[in-house]
């Protein structure tokens, strides 16, 4: 399977909400013993590999934000912890999964990574990730609402196999 980042850059004004999205697609083993973890974290553009470093998003770790479910089931983080930090991660039946960040500040600017791990019998079989940049702007140069810039075809299949 693969993960596509629909947009490689989001430019938003301070105070806005933004939803960063990844799409998970390709052949999915629908065996009863196969499940998926999907999560989000911040990172930096490493020289060797993007998304190798994991940093929290608003003090929440990738474990706090993870979704666990079978195949293309829908799921979302309902726990208070994420919502108290103005965050919500969600996943739909079509392979889209996202993180919504409310009331953006300049501190939210940076590189964000989505990660999908295929699990069989409690063990990691495959893992893929996608990366996107968020720029939060203030002042007269800031857009009035969020603008998302599409990924190039090469970037949009940002694949890291296990």
């Amino acid at each position: 399977f693969k993960v596509a980042t629909l947009y490689s850059l989001y430019v938003c004004p301070e105070g806005q909400n933004v939803t960063l999205t990844c799409r998970f697609f390709g052949p999915v083993d629908k065996g009863h013993d196969v499940t998926f973890y999907k999560t989000w974290y911040r990172s930096s553009r490493g020289e060797v590999q993007t998304c190798s470093e994991r940093r929290p998003i608003r003090n929440l770790t990738f474990q706090d934000l993870h979704l666990h479910h079978g195949g293309h089931q829908a799921a979302n983080t309902s726990h208070d912890l994420a919502q108290r930090h103005g965050l919500e991660s969600a996943s739909d039946h079509h392979g889209n999964f996202s993180i919504t960040m409310r009331n953006l500040t300049l501190l939210d600017s940076g590189l964000y990574c989505c990660l999908v791990v295929e699990i069989r019998h409690h063990h990691s079989e495959h893992r893929v990730h996608g990366a996107m940049e968020l720029q939060v702007q203030t002042g007269k140069d800031a857009p009035s609402s969020c603008v998302a810039y599409p990924s190039s075809s090469q970037e949009s299949e940002n694949i890291t196999a296990a």
Epitope: H68, G70, H121, H123, S124
Partner: antibody, heavy 123, light 112 residues
């Protein structure tokens, strides 16, 4: 510190069901899995299965598949293991254990264990 | 199911002497992802099991460095470089590579 506290000893009749609880504290409940292992008197250890608290997904040893149910209550950080159609061979100490995994959700060990719950099946 | 066979089943040791426990699996326990999920647990008398070693050779935090694990494929060994009185109990190997996960029958270590 990490603690798994299990419910007290039970005596059941053959054919009945038993529900053992395991209350977790000292860590974030949804960041780890919970496994169940049993030990018959004077015998070795036998793995029964596990549950993923964040989703409720569980996977069981085929030997117990038709008789075991693992559930969780995230509001109280408690996992339950129910075993039905009890027979004398089910007399054992039942342990819950925390399943640790790495940054890619890959299990590597049962790192902390409960104190055990003795279930006696006798007519 | 994978059968884990330990030897010896009983191991009398003099304090300060080394000890070695063998664990053999009925088939390879190398997982398809390349990892080998072989663990060692110690159950002291009247207590719950406790983790010693995971993924063949990694010592769990707080486990003394006199404990070491090694092996590959189907043959694994737990070594105690210098046995102490507190090491008495039953040692179990455990494979978590193939469902159902299975324990060895246990090796009882006692002080001579």
């Amino acid at each position: 510190q990490v603690q798994l506290v299990q419910s007290g000893a039970e005596v059941k009749k053959p054919g009945a069901s038993v529900k053992v609880s395991c209350k977790a504290s000292g860590y974030t409940f949804t960041h780890y899995t919970i496994h169940w292992v049993r030990q018959a008197p004077g015998q070795g250890l036998e793995w029964m299965g596990y549950i993923i608290p964040s989703s409720g997904y569980s996977e069981y040893n085929q030997k117990f598949k038709d008789r075991v149910t693992m559930t969780r209550d995230t509001s109280t950080s408690t996992v339950y293991m129910e075993l039905s159609s009890l027979r004398s061979e089910d007399t054992a100490v039942y342990y819950c254990a925390r399943g640790a995994y790495d940054d890619y959700y890959d299990y590597y060990a049962m790192d902390y264990w409960g104190q055990g719950t003795l279930v006696t099946v006798s007519s | 199911d994978i059968v884990m066979t330990q030897s010896p089943l009983s191991l009398p040791v003099t304090p300060g002497e080394p000890a070695s426990i063998s664990c053999r699996s009925s088939q390879t326990i190398v997982h398809s992802n390349g990892n080998t999920y072989l663990e060692w647990y110690l159950q002291k008398p009247g207590q719950s099991p406790q983790l010693l070693i995971y993924k063949v050779s990694n010592r769990f935090s707080g486990v003394p460095d006199r404990f070491s694990g090694s092996g590959s494929g189907t043959d694994f060994t737990l070594k105690i470089s210098r046995v102490e009185a507190e090491d008495v109990g039953v040692y179990y190997c455990f494979q978590a590579s193939h469902v159902p996960w299975t324990f060895g029958q246990g090796t009882k270590l006692e002080i001579k």
